[in-house]
Interface confidence: low
């Protein structure tokens, strides 16, 4: 019996140690989103095990203060869905000491009425505005730079109309360095990680996207005022294209943003002459007046493989030849304006015979097929070099329809250390939840325990292999402290144990002779310290009342030997 797998929060993630009782689930949010609810859930034992709390959600907060802002993003409430009306959100970004900020406009989509975005070069609402959506028709593609360590961002919306709002990316950068570049729907590689003068950065787009504007390679220049010599490019899903890759992606124009109305797009996909093409239509959400047509050949007079309007779930098509023409016509009259409305088509070159298509090598890894011929049933296993981990399925199987059971995996650089774990009798302070390179974990021992080892661990990158902690996790050992000296038993009372010295942490108990009541603490503890000391003064035994006193005395006489021996032991 186990707990159900916890729901992954939208715009966040969950990692689960175990679904069995005692197992835990940790939640964290994507940058720009904040966790609402418990960060950590535990699976409790019961006839039907259950999580000790409700799954949290990730929300985009309306404003906030981000101190020590290194890299991240701020997003408007509801993003990428629409924001709500009558908002006034203020964000204060503060870079680490001695650093400045750069802002990238990842997306700004405001309703055309009185919704407004203002960015101020300072730390308060009166600081000078460096961007005002009222005054600027086009977003500055090169972004904004702060002159000090602050940016103050204001988003205000009125009572009518709503739109997707905004996503702004921020990067702090040091004096003498350029800011970290950014390309939406793409990637970049850098010659150095901190972008000093002389750094070159090369951009590439995700499959299905095309580099537009700017330059593919940019360089950090000018030691006096470091800056990129060109604007960063943009990656966009374009309308039409000729593709000659053996595998790739065709996206609806502007994906994942909505495509425009009245569009007429034609893509030609061409593979090697003796091959054919498998089209894997993973997303198809178009309007009823829009048409997506697949032609089995290299022009629009070829046989129609399929023609689709409206939404449809995942399906595949196979061409009979080495060319396919994809045509998309959107209704000029109406438009489907939702996010992720459009289509995502993956295509693969496949042989015409009885084998699955040859699988490519993957960067930073290798493949090992179960047999040389890629016939039905063949299994190919992908593995990664040290320092990289498989993303996706590492095992692919050639299926009966001569397609691979899974998408091609990739080898991703391991950019974080494993969780070093908790140390008994301590608490820990973590600089970053996923332990990226540069993250620190500080262990602080509980009172009465001393640290053996390093109190701060730092995650370091390595040339070969995965990042590694600077040291082993420490231990918290019980402090060897001086004992407390024994206390006398109270008059007409007793104590146990009857030692002269009591170790730190020990407890002694007091009791009174019959007819007496204890005034004070019945148990007191030897509190560890320098020196160790008793937690309370010793109690006293007081006669309960005069009647009680005489009654107890007569009882004492009646059982004199026992009573006197007790009293003797107490002195």
């Amino acid at each position: 019996l186990s707990c159900h797998f916890p729901r992954r929060p939208a715009y966040g993630d969950v990692t689960v140690t175990s679904l069995h009782p005692g197992g835990s689930a940790r939640f964290h949010c994507a940058t720009g989103y904040q966790l609402k609810g418990a960060r950590h859930l535990t699976c409790l034992n019961a006839t039907q095990p259950f999580w000790d709390s409700k799954e949290p959600v990730c929300i985009a907060a309306c404003g906030g203060v981000i101190r020590n802002a290194t890299t991240g993003r701020i997003v408007s409430p509801g993003f990428p869905g629409n924001y709500s009306n009558n908002l006034t959100c203020h964000w204060l970004l503060e870079a680490p000491e001695g650093q400045r900020l750069h802002l990238h406009f990842e997306k700004v989509s405001l309703a055309e009425d009185d919704d407004r975005l203002i960015i101020r070069n300072g730390d308060n609402v009166e600081a000078p505005p460096v961007y005002d959506s009222y005054e600027v028709e086009y977003l500055p593609i090169e972004g904004l730079l702060s002159s000090g360590k602050h940016f103050f961002v204001e988003l205000s919306t009125d009572s009518s109309g709503a739109a997707a709002g905004m996503a702004l990316r921020y990067e702090a950068f040091q004096q003498g360095h350029c800011y970290e570049p950014f390309v939406k729907y793409g990637n970049f590689s850098s010659s150095t990680p901190t972008y000093p003068v002389g750094t070159t950065v090369e951009f590439s787009c995700d499959p299905g996207y095309t580099l537009e504007q700017g330059s593919i390679i940019i360089e950090c220049v000018d030691p006096h005022d470091p800056q990129w010599n060109e604007t960063e490019p943009a990656c966009r899903a374009v309308c039409s294209g000729e593709i000659t890759d053996s595998a790739g992606v065709v996206l609806s124009p502007n994906w994942p943003e909505p495509y425009g109305r009245g569009q007429d797009c034609i893509w030609g996909v061409h593979v090697e002459e003796d091959k054919r093409i498998m089209l894997d239509i993973r997303v198809l959400r178009i309007g009823p007046g829009d048409v997506l047509t697949f032609y089995d050949g290299d022009d629009l007079t070829a046989r129609v493989l399929g023609q689709y309007s409206g939404p449809r779930s995942h399906f595949k098509l196979f061409t009979s030849m080495a060319d396919v023409t994809i045509q998309f016509q959107s209704d000029p009259g109406t438009s489907v304006l939702g996010y992720q409305q459009g289509f995502v088509i993956h295509f693969f070159e496949v042989p015409r015979n009885d084998t699955c298509p040859e699988l490519p090598e993957i960067p930073n890894g290798w493949k090992s097929p179960s047999q040389p011929e890629l016939v039905h049933g063949t299994v190919v296993t992908y593995q990664c070099y040290p320092g990289y981990q498989v993303v996706g399925s590492s095992v692919l199987m050639c299926q009966w329809d001569l397609t691979w059971s899974e998408d091609l995996p990739s080898c991703q650089r391991v950019t974080s250390c494993h969780d070093p774990g908790d140390v008994e009798h301590s608490r820990r302070l973590i600089s970053s939840p996923k332990f990226p390179v540069g993250a620190t974990v500080q262990y602080i021992c509980d009172q009465g325990f001393v640290l053996m080892g390093s109190s701060i661990l730092t995650c370091h990158d390595r040339q070969a292999g995965s990042p590694k902690w600077s040291d082993r996790a420490p231990k918290c050992l019980l402090e060897q402290l001086k004992p407390c000296h024994g206390l006398s038993a109270p008059e007409n009372g007793a104590r146990s144990p009857e030692k002269q010295l009591h170790p730190a942490g020990a407890t002694i108990h007091f009791s009174c002779a019959p007819g007496y009541v204890l005034k004070g603490q019945a148990s007191i503890k030897c509190v560890p310290g320098h020196p160790s000391h008793w937690s309370d003064p010793p109690p006293i035994c007081r006669a309960a009342s005069l009647d009680g006193f005489y009654n107890s005395r007569s009882l004492d006489v009646a059982k004199a030997p026992a009573a006197s021996s007790t009293l003797d032991a107490a002195h």
């Epitope: 095309t210 580099l211 374009v238 309308c239 000729e242 000659t244 007429d264 629009l300 007079t301």
Partner: antibody
């Protein structure tokens, strides 16, 4: 702004070859195909083919296969077309034009004269 | 190959006059037609794509339309800059094919 600058006029002997160029500027060269068109004196236009500079994929009009060879140099954002085994039939103005939905922009043309 | 038949091959008209040029496709081209203008100095400019979409910078007096396999270019009121050669081009199928052209002259 987008510009396609073609090379100057060529005078060639029958049987020889000529190579003309079309230099693109004002846009990302690899994002669009480049088409070539022929126009004989006083006649209409004929499509020769196109090249996709990002992949070097070419598509020829059957009529010009073996006659024309299209190439592209990404580093200089220049498309080239070579005509071989020239005859008087090849005397014409040759235009380059930018795709994808073709011919949004045109070069000014290169005049090729084949004469003994 | 798809044949594009353009008519008339030449046309004389006066300033301010309305003129129409036509292209007929031998096969279905689904509106994938371009209209081009070639000036006497050889300069070529695209006026219309997708049969009726005006390119930016093209005056509103120019329009394109379709009726079945017939495609028309209309200039509602001729100006001096409009006297030139006009070609249609289909881009539905390879090889791309042009119409024979129309010479528009000042009467």
């Amino acid at each position: 702004q987008v510009q396609l600058q073609q090379s100057g006029a060529e005078l060639a002997r029958p049987g020889a070859s000529v190579k003309m160029s079309c230099k693109a500027s004002g846009y990302t060269f690899t994002s669009y195909t480049m088409h070539w068109v022929k126009q004989r004196p006083g006649q209409g236009l004929e499509w020769i083919g196109y090249i996709n500079p990002s992949s070097d994929y070419t598509k020829y009009n059957q009529k010009f296969k073996g006659k024309a060879t299209m190439t592209a140099d990404k580093s200089s954002s220049t498309a080239y077309m070579q005509l071989s085994s020239l005859t008087s039939e090849d005397s014409a103005v040759y235009y380059c034009g930018r795709g994808l939905v073709p011919f949004a922009y045109w070069g000014q043309g290169t005049l090729v004269t084949v004469s003994a | 190959d798809i044949q594009m038949t353009q008519s008339p091959s030449s046309l004389s008209a006066s300033l301010g006059e309305r003129v129409s040029l036509t292209c007929r496709a031998s096969q279905e081209i689904s509106g994938y037609l371009i209209w081009l203008q070639q000036k006497p100095d050889g300069t070529i400019k695209r006026l219309i794509y997708a049969a009726s979409t005006l390119d930016s910078g093209v005056p509103k007096r120019v329009s394109g339309s379709r009726s079945g396999s017939d495609y028309s270019l209309t200039i509602s009121s001729l100006e001096s800059e409009d006297f030139a050669d006009y070609y249609c081009l289909q881009y539905a199928s390879y090889p791309l094919t042009f119409g024979g052209g129309t010479k528009l002259e000042l009467k």
